[in-house]
């Protein structure tokens, strides 16, 4: 059976039941690769209270429709007089980014999730060439979600003192130049999430490969690398790379623009102070 949402397949995704202190790991096309959940678990529940793991969805027992994915298990659940099995159910809705699976509720037998994602859209209008997961949970299971920063067209201009070049970036996905045809970005190669513009030329200096990472409390890191082997002649033989560090501000303040903090041999380091780097509880307070 072919994978129903191939663009979601490359990653293991996370969702949280905050009420019960549970972290779910979800891999919709394969298994989550957590030993304690067994070799074929597609949905693995990590109970942080008891430090135990339980598989609540088996990759082998998958059934799919256009908007619903179900993973059964062979574990029976306690509903009296029935032979129900524990299962996970993921409802997919069209969204503007890859999005995040959200825990909805869990009964004795079924763990329910909802996922707003471009992967579920009938038309390709919001689909990216390349996009990576754009959220993380910290050790207290609080969500840090940069999805609202993702530009569906155009890009962010990085604050840089160099008058001869302009560095444009998008967050977690490539820059869509087709929907923004009148700008400098038109020359940016397809797939690039970090585009360096020099005069009338534009260069791919990084594409998203891995999802967002939490490196320290309230510091999130996104790394882009140039996939093509061909070196750029102004990089002194080095492969271009871009590291964007998103920082939660220490106090309430207006959002800033991304700033270039270091540049050497086509390695660009960017810092972006933004409240989106803060956990969701902070944003909602």
């Amino acid at each position: 059976q072919a994978a129903p949402f191939p663009e979601l397949c490359s990653y293991t995704w996370e969702a949280v039941d905050t009420k019960n202190n549970v972290l779910y790991k979800i891999n919709i096309c394969g298994s989550v690769d957590i030993v304690q959940c067994g070799p074929s678990s597609a949905v693995c529940m990590h109970d942080l209270k008891t430090r135990t793991y339980h598989s609540v969805g088996d990759s082998v027992l998958r059934s799919a429709t256009r908007s619903l994915l179900e993973f059964n298990t062979t574990v029976s659940c306690d509903q009296q007089g029935t032979n129900h099995r524990v299962q996970s159910s993921i409802a997919f809705l069209c969204g503007k980014t890859l999005g995040t699976p959200e825990f909805v509720t869990a009964t004795e037998c079924v763990h329910y999730f909802e996922w707003r994602t471009t992967a579920a859209c009938k038309k390709d209008i919001f689909k990216a060439n390349k996009e990576v997961p754009c959220y993380v949970f910290d050790e207290e299971l609080r969500k840090h979600d940069l999805n609202p920063l993702i530009k569906l067209s155009g890009a962010y201009l990085v604050d840089d003192s160099d008058p001869d070049t302009s560095l444009f970036i998008n967050v977690c996905r490539d820059i869509d130049t087709l929907r923004d045809p009148g700008s400098q970005l038109r020359a940016c190669p397809p797939g690039t999430a970090a585009c360096l513009v020099r005069g009338h030329q534009a260069f791919d200096v990084g594409q998203p490969r891995d999802g967002l990472k939490l490196v320290r409390k309230d510091r999130l890191v996104l790394s882009y690398v140039r996939e093509e082997a061909g070196k750029l002649d102004f990089c002194d033989g080095h492969s271009p790379a871009v590291t964007i560090t998103f920082v939660c501000p220490s106090e309430r303040r207006e959002g800033t623009i991304p700033k270039l903090t270091a540049k050497s041999n086509c390695r660009y380091e960017i810092e972006w102070i933004t409240e989106y780097a803060c956990h969701r509880d902070y944003l909602e307070s």
């Epitope: 905050t18 009420k19 019960n20 202190n21 209270k49 659940c77 306690d78 509720t105 009964t107 004795e108």
Partner: nanobody, 116 residues
């Protein structure tokens, strides 16, 4: 005052059954996740079963198929039905309530002895 009170422990023969109760007061019971733990003499406290606020249940491998956790929200009580008891089930059984807004609350424990 927030408290949990366990009851139902006692002496039972191997293969027998017991039902433990844990009555809660001072908390919105249905919002809380409830866990049973046990501590055998000279051993560390170990987790036995969980009943989440939404209703899902999980069990330690050692009790799976023999023990059942359930709750009665009207009575603010969680139960642990223990069947096919074995000598190695002998322990003090504790219940625990937890929610995102409260620190974990433990009961004082009830002793279960399985012996012939």
């Amino acid at each position: 005052d927030v408290q949990l009170v366990e009851s139902g422990g006692g002496l039972v023969q191997p293969g027998g059954s017991l039902r433990l109760s844990c009555a809660a007061s001072g908390i919105i019971f249905s919002d809380n996740r409830m866990d049973w733990y046990r501590q055998a003499p000279g051993k560390q406290r170990e987790w036995v079963a969980t009943l989440a606020s939404y209703g899902w249940k999980t069990y330690a491998d050692s009790v799976k198929g023999r023990f059942t956790i359930s709750r009665d929200n009207a009575k603010n009580t969680v139960y642990l039905q223990m069947n096919s008891l074995r000598p190695e089930d002998t322990a003090v059984y504790y219940c625990k309530a937890s929610s995102p807004v409260l620190n974990d609350i433990w009961g004082q424990g009830t002793l279960v002895t399985v012996s012939s």
